[in-house]
Interface confidence: medium
């Protein structure tokens, strides 16, 4: 036989049997010769257990590279693969030998000593119970207990192979405590050894690194990374770490199990990586991998090593922040720093402390921003190690969506008389200034009214006042600008040339921050008119009357009602004139009817008016033809009685003969006080030189004479008493003699 030289291809050794599978009977002798090109060795089943005494390997006499394997008195357990191979190579020839032993069809292998089968509860996993056979074509089933269950090969996932054993999906036997294989030969039943079933967990729920994300350190500091794995029970776990630096001498890894909390269905494992003194070469990605045999999970973090402490603002820092009034403002601080800096906020130079409206820290939060909050905010960062400081200023601009002044007022309930000219205004404050104010309108009957809501009027669509179709004749005047309450406001006015149609008008103001609107009810009536007598504003305890005048040809059933606080049901209707629909809910007043040639006049007299008489009074009249009720509302305001007061000082005056003296006696009081002037305690009477104006408030003395000097007293009196104030007139100069010829 030729010797194989290096470089030549190595042919597998040749066996004396040509078959891949050899079947022999028990108690006979097995002999196989192997010939090859270099040194040979044999491997046979259960090699480690049976020492060489039963198996003989001998040199052939006729060839240098030839060995014969002899096994006398073979038994079923000798069934298996017999392999002849070249030393130090993978080149081999194999024959599988079945030793047919009908008394012992199952082979017990070396590893079967323990008789343990490890399985995982995985639907896709199969397990092999190693009950190999000494006969290739046995009918084998698997018995599991307890409860007792038998599994038969199904030609699919359940099978028996004499060389491997019984294969079955692991979940099918996960309930069992033990399993064994069973074969039937000539009505005789044979069993393999018992295998204990151990369910092994494999699921890793998660792997968590602490600290997570990115870790920042300065050179020389200690790094401690904890890797915690949470698994199901019955799991064995291996950890491995990947890290940047190849120098391992300064790294220390400790793995340990963590005691699970009682009642938990998870197991915890911890691996700790420690570097006592980090260097720049330790910077990089650190990955912790946990492996359970069937499952791998990993997590990673980045360790950044700085050569020294530092501080700087990030590029994303804004210099201008705009916010809408009422919103929450957040001004984040973006910085690059190691270690984390101390952060201090200042507003217009003053430090800001956290309170219920402002929270300071990594970001400045203003809970509900107001215009007062506008200004310059400065954030100062301090590095706690190096004490280096950095500052950045942010200007906060607070935008105000349009606020319509009249919205704050309770809309007057007065109706508008047919055919009259009326002016509607919207006073708007907005910051930044308005893009525009637009006016819209819609017919009263095209809208619905729900007084309980914030905005009681709902119109499906609004029509621009430039849509001239169907409303009152309108003119929008040029916007006026006025400083009101210290704010620049825009006043937009809508002039209704003649009130013919009941409508709703809406002014809509828009700026960068949003929009505001005000809906004005413009209810036109062609009916009764309300007047107050006397025309002056009434004061308590005075006598006064409310007159409701209606055309006798058009109206009948004139009635006065008071819209009292008890009349809440008034607000339940859908109509835009809900008062008229709920007259029964109002307090009916007794009035006196007078008539003239064209009108009926219903008068409610207040002999001794009190503050309780204030409120909204409704005059109702019924259209004779249509029977429709018309209602008119008048708000009656009664002034509280007030004793007279002199509201300013009367200054002493010095003047020269022939000049004019003017003095005003500023008074207040209800009813309006009666003013009397005295000179040196004598009542002052008007003459050619002494003039009293504005209800005697203004005293003028023209071409003063020496004798006009003296003590002047102003006295203001009403039913509650009098008030007095005095002034001294000093007249200087010499009286000229008048020549009367």
């Amino acid at each position: 036989a030729s010797v194989g030289l290096p470089g030549d291809s190595l042919h597998p050794p040749k066996l004396s049997t040509q078959k891949d599978i050899l079947t022999i009977l028990a108690n006979t002798t097995l002999q196989i010769t192997c010939r090859g090109q270099r040194d040979l060795d044999w491997l046979w089943p259960n090699t480690p257990r049976d020492s060489e005494e039963r198996v003989l390997v001998t040199e052939c006499g006729d060839s240098i590279f030839c060995k014969t394997l002899t096994v006398p008195r073979v038994v079923g357990n000798d069934t298996g693969a017999y392999k002849c191979f070249y030393r130090d190579t993978d080149v081999s020839s194999i024959v599988y030998v079945y030793v047919q032993d009908h008394r012992s069809p199952f082979i017990a292998s070396v590893s079967d000593e323990h008789g343990i089968v490890y399985i995982t509860e995985n639907k896709n996993k199969t397990v092999v119970i190693p009950c190999r056979g000494s006969i290739s074509n046995l009918n084998v089933s698997l018995c599991a207990r307890y409860p007792e269950k038998r599994f038969v090969p199904d030609g699919n996932r359940i099978s028996w192979d004499s060389e491997k054993g019984f294969t079955i999906p692991s979940y099918m036997i996960s309930y069992a405590g033990m399993v064994f294989c069973e074969a039937k030969i000539n009505d005789e039943t044979y069993q393999s050894i018992m295998y204990i079933v151990l369910v092994v967990g494999y699921r890793i729920y998660d792997v968590v690194l602490s600290p997570p994300h990115e870790i920042e350190l300065s050179a020389g500091e200690k790094l401690v990374l904890n890797c915690t794995a949470r698994t199901e029970l019955n799991v064995g776990l291996d950890f491995s770490w990947q890290f940047p630096s190849s120098k391992h001498q300064h790294k220390k890894i400790v793995n340990r199990d963590v005691k699970s909390l009682p009642g938990t269905v998870a197991k915890m494992f911890l691996s700790t990586l420690t570097i006592d003194s980090v260097t720049k070469s330790d910077q990089g990605e650190y990955t912790c991998t946990a492996y359970s045999g069937l499952m791998t999970k990993k997590n990673k973090t980045f360790v950044r090593v700085h050569t020294k402490p530092f501080i700087a603002f990030g590029s994303g820092m804004k210099s201008l922040v705009e916010a809408t009034v009422g919103s929450q403002v957040r001004i984040p601080v973006k910085y690059l720093s190691y270690p984390a800096p101390d952060i201090k906020w200042y507003r217009n130079g003053r430090p800001i402390e956290s309170n219920y409206t402002m929270i300071v820290g990594d970001e400045l939060t203003i809970m509900e921003v107001s215009e007062r909050d506008a200004g310059n905010y400065t954030v100062i960062l301090t590095n706690p190690i190096s004490m280096e400081k950095q500052s950045h200023m942010v200007s906060l601009v607070v935008n105000v969506p349009p606020q319509i002044g009249e919205k704050a007022l309770i809309s007057p309930m007065d109706s508008y008389q047919y055919g009259t000219m009326q002016t509607l205004t919207c006073t708007v404050y907005a910051n930044p200034p308005l893009h525009h104010i637009q006016w819209y309108w819609q017919l009263e009957e095209a809208c619905s009214y729900r007084p309980s809501q914030t905005n009681p009027y709902t119109c499906k669509e609004w029509r621009h006042v430039k849509d001239f179709q169907g409303g009152n004749k309108i003119e929008v005047t040029k916007n006026q600008y006025a400083l009101i309450e210290g704010k620049n406001k825009t006043v937009s006015t809508l002039v209704i040339q003649a009130a013919y149609v009941s409508a709703l008008y809406k002014c809509e103001a828009i700026n960068k921050a949003g929009r505001g609107e005000r809906v004005i009810s413009f209810h036109v009536i062609r009916g009764p008119e309300i007047t107050v007598q006397p025309a002056t504003q009434p004061t308590e305890r005075e006598s006064m009357s409310l007159l409701c005048t209606a055309d006798r040809n058009t109206f009948e059933n004139l009635t006065w009602y008071k819209l009292g606080s008890q009349a809440t049901s008034v607000h339940m209707g859908e109509s835009l004139t809900p008062v008229c629909k709920n007259l029964d809910a109002l307090w009916k007043l007794n009035g006196t009817v007078f008539s003239n040639s064209t009108n009926d006049i219903l008068i409610v007299a207040f002999q001794n008016a009190s503050l309780q008489d204030q409120g909204n009074y409704v005059c109702s009249a019924q259209d004779k033809k249509t029977k429709k009720r018309h209602c008119l509302v008048k708000q009656l305001v009664i002034l509280e009685r007030m004793a007279p007061m002199i509201t300013g000082n009367l200054e002493n005056q010095t003047t020269t003969i022939g000049e004019t003296i003017e003095v005003v006696c500023p008074t207040s009081g209800n009813p309006t006080p009666l003013i009397t002037w005295f000179k040196d305690n004598e009542t002052l009477v008007e003459d050619s030189g002494i003039v009293l104006k504005d209800g005697n408030r203004n005293l003028t003395i023209r071409r003063v004479r020496k004798e006009d000097g003296g003590l002047y007293t102003c006295q203001a009196c009403n039913v509650l008493g009098c008030a007095r104030a005095e002034t001294l007139f000093i007249i200087e100069g010499v009286q000229e003699k008048t020549n009367l010829e």
């Epitope: 179709q469 169907g470 013919y500």
Partner: antibody, heavy 115, light 108 residues
Framework: EVQLLESGGGLVQPGGSLRLSCAAS????????MGWVRQAPGKGLEWVSS????????NYADSVKGRFTISRDNSKNTLYLQMNSLRAEDTAVYYC????????WGQGTLVTVSS | DIQMTQSPGTLSLSPGDRATLSCRAS???????LAWYQQKPGQAPRVLIY???TRATGIPDRFTGSGSGTDFTLTISRLEPEDSAVYYC?????????FGGGTKVEIK
């Protein structure tokens, strides 16, 4: 689609009466001012009368005041023109139109006053 | 009452020409309550312009309204054969409403 359809025109003797109707569709009739405009043969346009949405206010040309009455029934989406004491000079095509300026017109109905 | 006067009575122009129609009110028309109409023979009028300068829906942009107070103008920038019609102005500022006498535009 907005549509206005006049009816009621015809031949009438001087001093007689006619009632014109205008059926409206395709819009919310009760929201709009409605009017009548006439055009005598070979002449220009002449406004006759207008009525406000709820029917509460009406306006008339001096030439028809006291003789013609404009009215509307919002529930029926219909505009009317009652013409009494008709004269020869009232002969014209009468158009029903929507609005203060007239954005939609009917095709007109001819009224002839002649003995 | 407001009287409306239109000029010229007739305007004879070629296609592509610019037509300028004038309308004068006897007193000021507030807030530009003025409209322009086009009427072709045998048809009802149709509105072109309202509010003195606002084009009505579907009206080509060659029709432009301008003016305020007492003097108003309708301009047709490039005349087309279908523009041959009578054009009326109308004030709707105050009652009684009134139309101008009309301007007839002929295309040569």
């Amino acid at each position: 689609e907005v549509q206005l359809l006049e009816s009621g025109g015809g031949l009438v003797q001087p001093g007689g009466s006619l009632r014109l109707s205008c059926a409206a569709s395709g819009f919310t009739f009760s929201w709009y001012v409605m009017g009548w405009v006439r055009q005598a043969p070979g002449k220009g346009l002449e406004w006759v009368s207008s009525i406000y949405p709820s029917g509460g206010a009406t306006n008339y040309a001096d030439s028809v005041k006291g003789r013609f009455t404009i009215s509307r029934d919002n529930s029926k989406n219909t505009l009317y023109l009652q013409m009494n004491s008709l004269r020869a000079e009232d002969t014209a095509v009468y158009y029903c139109a929507r609005g203060n300026y007239f954005d939609y017109w009917g095709q007109g109905t001819l009224v002839t006053v002649s003995s | 009452d407001i009287q409306m006067t239109q000029s010229p009575g007739t305007l004879s122009l070629s296609p592509g020409d610019r037509a300028t129609l004038s309308c004068r009110a006897s007193q000021s028309v507030s807030s530009n309550y003025l409209a322009w109409y086009q009427q072709k023979p045998g048809q009802a009028p149709r509105v072109l312009i309202y509010g003195a300068s606002t084009r009505a829906t579907g009206i080509p942009d060659r029709f432009t309204g301008s003016g305020s107070g007492t003097d108003f103008t309708l301009t047709i920038s490039r005349l087309e054969p279908e523009d041959s019609a009578v054009y009326y102005c109308q004030q709707f500022d105050s009652s009684p409403l009134s139309f101008g006498g009309g301007t007839k535009v002929e295309i040569k």
